[in-house]
């Protein structure tokens, strides 16, 4: 058993039918010695008396808010949560496996640049009685500071019969140098509590591996005289690291017809302009990627050919 | 990156071309190692990230763009010197690059070259003959060193009398390649910045 926060405790259980569970001793936080009784949650049934209460915690019915009283007055509370270990593996009931980039990905994180700021998000089908708290650091043995905000509900989607809820959090490394070569990964730890169930999820990554630039901005077309060709130009996104000659991007320019089946023409360039043939009803899209370290491509920025 | 790219003309700044070749070569070599050594811990998540140049060179700090010198987090161990040198900068006026930066890059390349050659000698003794270093990568390191044109004492190739542990050697190869790729990215960024200066 360990303390998650004041008066909230997590009991780790080897989870299988007929498991013996864990013996837990609760102590009433009071100078009083006599006339103390214990109850669980809203029930008035007295579970025991005395300054300490010994319980055998086996299932969720044994978890909850234990309260010690004296003469109708509440003295203190202890909330017991359960953390299930199923055949050596901690349960992952609360969050959905996003399966991207690989199976067992519960937390996904992205950074728009090398400033040390990143966003993580996760999915759940649970709508109520749910709380998250997020911690992060650079490295684990001698951790360096990363400050995270509060996790917030960022999106709701309908997936088949189910509603899916997306939560996200923003974090910032306390002292980040954009040019630094990372040797210790960022660690992100999310504590999730649903009703009386506790779970924790972790992700470990280098900022360089989670870079996804914003799409190029100011995408413009300039028709070339007496030609079906146009000059496409764009700019680096505002959120990208500077100077741009050091943090360079490479670009992919795509000409896409109205029909998804039509052949796509693609050009790759390090410049911020390109000459392409603009077909009728087609659109031109441009996306960006770090020129030297192949992490994710940005989303497309698009303009119609007409 | 295995994609057709319209590359800029590197004419004015010869080192840019060499550094791009270097990054391409080390990335290809790392990809090959990860595929060939699939039953070894060779992915970024599995290896220990060691930097053989740590405390010996200061490339990141010495080659910091001027714009980032205002960022205190980048100035932890910055040694500044604005004297330019080396043939890559042939008659180019710049306040960004300093002798320390170029010589630091040169020293990095020299250290990795020695490590890779020593390692290749061991890998050639492996009866499994599973993986060897790409000669192209070694050649590209050499070309960039020549373009940098710094004179420094040659480091003797390490020779080891004891029987090599091939498992450990292959894991060390993965560690070296990951670290060298990261350094090659930094070198490319520096050369690109210099080219634009």
């Amino acid at each position: 058993i360990w303390e998650l926060k004041k008066d909230v405790y997590v009991v780790e259980l080897d989870w299988y039918p007929d498991a013996p569970g864990e013996m837990v001793v609760l102590t009433c936080d009071t100078p009083e010695e006599d006339g103390i009784t214990w109850t669980l949650d809203q029930s008035s049934e007295v579970l025991g008396s005395g300054k300490t209460l010994t319980i055998q915690v086996k299932e969720f019915g044994d978890a909850g808010q234990y309260t010690c009283h004296k003469g109708g007055e509440v003295l203190s509370h202890s909330l017991l949560l359960l953390h299930k270990k199923e055949d050596g593996i901690w349960s992952t009931d609360i969050l959905k496996d996003q399966k991207e980039p690989k199976n067992k990905t519960f937390l996904r994180c992205e950074a728009k640049n090398y400033s040390g700021r990143f966003t993580c998000w996760w999915l759940t089908t649970i709508s109520t009685d749910l709380t998250f708290s997020v911690k992060s650091s650079r490295g684990s043995s001698d951790p360096q500071g990363v400050t995270c905000g509060a996790a917030t509900l960022s999106a709701e989607r309908v997936r088949g019969d189910n509603k899916e809820y997306e939560y996200s959090v923003e974090c910032q490394e306390d002292s980040a140098c954009p040019a630094a070569e990372e040797s210790l990964p960022i660690e992100v730890m999310v504590d999730a509590v649903h009703k009386l169930k506790y779970e924790n999820y972790t992700s470990s990554f280098f900022i360089r591996d989670i870079i996804k630039p914003d799409p190029p901005k100011n995408l413009q077309l300039k028709p070339l005289k007496n030609s079906r060709q146009v000059e496409v130009s764009w700019e680096y996104p505002d959120t990208w690291s500077t100077p741009h000659s050091y943090f360079s991007l490479t670009f992919c320019v795509q000409v896409q017809g109205k029909s998804k089946r039509e052949k796509k023409d693609r050009v790759f360039t390090d410049k911020t302009s390109a000459t392409v043939i603009c077909r009728k009803n087609a659109s031109i899209s441009v996306r960006a990627q770090d020129r030297y370290y192949s992490s994710s491509w940005s989303e497309w920025a698009s303009v119609p050919c007409s | 990156r295995n994609l057709p790219v319209a590359t800029p003309d590197p004419g004015m700044f010869p080192c840019l071309h060499h550094s791009q070749n270097l990054l391409r070569a080390v990335s290809n070599m790392l990809q090959k190692a990860r595929q060939t050594l699939e039953f070894y811990p060779c992915t970024s998540e599995e290896i220990d990230h060691e930097d053989i140049t740590k405390d010996k060179t200061s490339t990141v700090e010495a080659c910091l763009p001027l714009e980032l010198t205002k960022n205190e987090s980048c100035l932890n161990s910055r040694e500044t010197s604005f004297i330019t040198n080396g043939s890559c900068l042939a008659s180019r006026k710049t306040s960004f690059m300093m002798a320390l930066c170029l010589s630091s890059i040169y020293e990095d390349l020299k250290m990795y070259q020695v490590e890779f050659k020593t390692m290749n000698a061991k890998l050639l003794m492996d009866p499994k003959r599973q993986i060897f270093l790409d000669q192209n990568m070694l050649a590209v390191i050499d070309e960039l060193m020549q373009a940098l044109n710094f004179n420094s004492e040659t480091v003797p190739q390490k020779s080891s009398l004891e029987e090599p542990d091939f498992y450990k050697t292959k894991i060390k190869l993965c560690i070296l390649l990951h670290a060298f790729r990261i350094r090659a990215v930094t070198i490319d960024r520096v050369m690109s910045y210099l080219n634009a200066s």
Epitope: W15, Y16, P17, G88, D93, N103 | P41
Partner: antibody, heavy 115, light 112 residues
């Protein structure tokens, strides 16, 4: 104590369907994940499917994906395996099993797919 | 397709020490715990070892398990006639959990 009693096995023609049941008692069935495992005659153990305690997630072996469906009725304390488009290679003894470090197995039920 | 490899058969005379190996990889045995089952003809498998080396109550102490790196092994010290059975190791893969990975199985024969 924990008991898993299986039923529903038998002889069936290729292409036909069959539903296996596994009745649980002696524990809070709705709090534990459950597996189906099979064993072809003279062969080793092969995992077939898993269902979470609340039925929210189901996982299948590639060999049965799209043909077999694992389900549970927590109000009846029963686990099911619906098997469709049966093939000769599905012939095996099928076992239900609790998920956990200490597991409990059903007695097994024989499924024979033969024309 | 089995990714945990066991020898097809091992044998020993009563009182001898018999060991069965179970070889896997970094993403299964290398990352997860191992169980061992005994299966007598016509019966359901019986749990012998969980969490690599733990014995459930009721399992004789002549059975012991161990794990090192990407391999595990089951030892029967002082093998007895009633130990003649099929033995299976089981683990998980970190990417396909909760799918059970079973070993290929080993037939233990007690001679004489």
């Amino acid at each position: 104590q924990v008991q898993l009693v299986q039923s529903g096995g038998g002889v069936v023609q290729p292409g036909r369907s069959l539903r296996l049941s596994c009745a649980a008692s002696g524990f809070t069935f709705s709090e534990y994940g459950m597996h189906w495992v099979r064993q072809a005659p003279g062969k080793g153990l092969e995992w077939v499917a898993f269902i979470r305690y609340d039925g929210s997630n189901k996982y299948y072996a590639d060999s049965v994906k799209g043909r077999f469906t694992i389900s549970r009725d927590n109000s009846k304390n029963t686990l099911y395996l619906q098997m469709k488009s049966l093939r000769a290679e599905d012939t095996a003894v099928y076992y239900c099993k609790t998920h956990g470090s200490h597991d409990n197995w059903g007695q097994g039920t024989m499924v024979t797919v033969s024309s | 397709s089995y990714v945990l490899t066991q020898p097809p058969s091992v044998s020993g005379t009563p009182g001898q020490r018999v060991t069965i190996s179970c070889s896997g990889g970094r993403s299964n045995i290398g990352s997860n715990t191992v169980k061992w089952y005994q299966q007598l003809p016509g019966t359901a498998p019986k749990l012998l070892i969980y969490y690599n080396d733990q014995r459930p109550s009721g399992v004789p102490d002549r059975f012991s398990g161990s794990k090192s790196g990407t391999s595990a092994s089951l030892a029967i010290t002082g093998v007895q006639a009633e130990d003649e059975a099929d033995y299976y190791c089981q683990s998980y893969d970190r990417y396909t959990h909760p799918a059970l990975l079973f070993g290929t199985g080993t037939k233990v024969t007690v001679l004489g």
